[in-house]
């Protein structure tokens, strides 16, 4: 601004936020996730950063283990407050198996449909949270390619808790969860030492999701 208050030049905003995303969070609910309220605390911290509404960001949640449950659809709630209340009530469904490919594929085929609230032309984001190698990993490569073909951006989070508790090597597990994440992996993959540490990645995860809105 000049001394006479005239605009002499302007700086374009770093990003223009359309604030429209369809986000489906795919949660591993098998028994080895412990304690479960670390997951609900993570959800709370992540969701409260979002501007949720039918013309803004929409969020759906899918829980998987031995089978898959739609906890709520993208169009179920129309405000952040409503989603926070619902997310807090999600109970762990248990099971010994971790059918990650099934969880992701169900989210792609069912959660991201118009019938469940997905909007045409709105960017699709999937956040996958798991703590173990999948029991259906032979299907994973195809399932991930199907997501790619439908332009679904994927963030994956590996919880190392059950491996650390059992003094097991995490190498194979981390590689699998990295393979789920979109490219570049370093911007789409996270790992945490245990369930309690999930809340420590919320800020970075949130920023990377919102960067997609540009």
């Amino acid at each position: 601004v000049s001394p006479t208050f005239q605009v002499v030049n302007s700086i374009a905003p770093v990003q223009e936020c359309s604030t429209q995303l369809d986000i489906v969070i795919v949660l591993d609910g098998s028994n080895s996730i412990y304690p479960w309220d670390s997951v609900t605390a993570f959800l709370n911290d992540l969701l409260e950063r979002m501007d949720i509404g039918p013309k803004q960001t929409q969020v759906g949640i899918v829980q998987y283990g031995e089978n898959v449950t739609h906890e709520f659809n993208l169009n179920k709630y129309s405000s952040t407050e409503e989603v926070l209340v619902a997310a807090k009530k999600i109970v762990q469904r248990g099971g010994r198996q971790t059918m990650t490919a099934l969880g992701i594929d169900t989210a792609r085929k069912e959660a991201f449909t118009e019938a469940r609230g997905a909007r045409r032309g709105v960017k699709k984001v999937m956040v996958i949270v798991t703590d173990g190698e999948s029991h259906d990993n032979h299907r994973l490569k195809k399932v991930i390619q199907d997501c790619e073909d439908e332009n679904i951006q994927r963030f994956s989070i590996a919880i190392l808790g059950s491996y650390n508790r059992g003094n097991l090597s995490t190498e194979k597990f981390v590689e699998e969860i990295k393979s789920i994440a979109s490219e570049p992996t370093e911007k789409h993959f996270f790992n945490v030492s245990d369930e309690l540490a999930l809340v420590t990645i919320v800020k970075a995860l949130g920023e990377r999701i919102f960067a997609l809105e540009a």
Epitope: N31, Y34, E66, G94, G95, R96, S162, R165, D194
Partner: antibody, heavy 124, light 108 residues
Framework: EVQLVQSGAEVKKPGESLRISCKGS????????IGWVRQMPGKGLEWMGI????????RYSPSFQGQVTISADKSISTAFLQWISLKASDTAMYYC??????????????????WGQGTLVTVS | EIVLTQSPGTLSLSPGERATLSCRAS???????LAWYQQKPAQAPRLLIY???RRATGIPDRFSGSGSGTDFTLTISRLEPEDFAVYYC?????????FGQGTTVEIK
Amino acid sequence: EVQLVQSGAEVKKPGESLRISCKGSGYSVSSYWIGWVRQMPGKGLEWMGIIYPGDSDTRYSPSFQGQVTISADKSISTAFLQWISLKASDTAMYYCARLQGDCSGGSCYGHFDYWGQGTLVTVS
Amino acid sequence: EIVLTQSPGTLSLSPGERATLSCRASQTISSGYLAWYQQKPAQAPRLLIYVASRRATGIPDRFSGSGSGTDFTLTISRLEPEDFAVYYCQQYGSSSWTFGQGTTVEIK
């Protein structure tokens, strides 16, 4: 509502066999471990063992290994605790409890969030 | 096997007073995997606290847990008449579950 309902009190003679039960409802019973806990008269709590009804995988406390048998029938959402030959020292209250946690991959961990009302077993 | 020692054995207090119960482990309990249960006469135990400090669903906020390593504490900030009972700590960080011998909180 999660519930664990145990079978009724039993009075037995030494040397007799017995099976008590614990029926779960209000959740997917085959997807959670169920533990058994003993409480002798006027005493504290002792963990006996744990079972995963989905596939009947079972772990025992060393103190109870070979003394009791834990089993489950997932089709009726029920876990069982069984003795082949009871002793007077088996007189106690027995509780079943749902494990919020896991017992695989080389480690067991978790807390018992829901408990049955208890089954009193008297051997005399 | 991790041995848990609770103290005191009995605590005699009046309603409205603060109760502090201690649970000491014979070795470090990994990840703070310690729970507290309340048991009233002729009733099953009830979960109060897990992972050392997290209150179970429906447990009033006058109950709080703290501690790590080998020393853990259950505090009842203001005793209500219904809080007089036996309290057990339980560890679950060593691939088995062991309980303390219990602390009785009785009316003075």
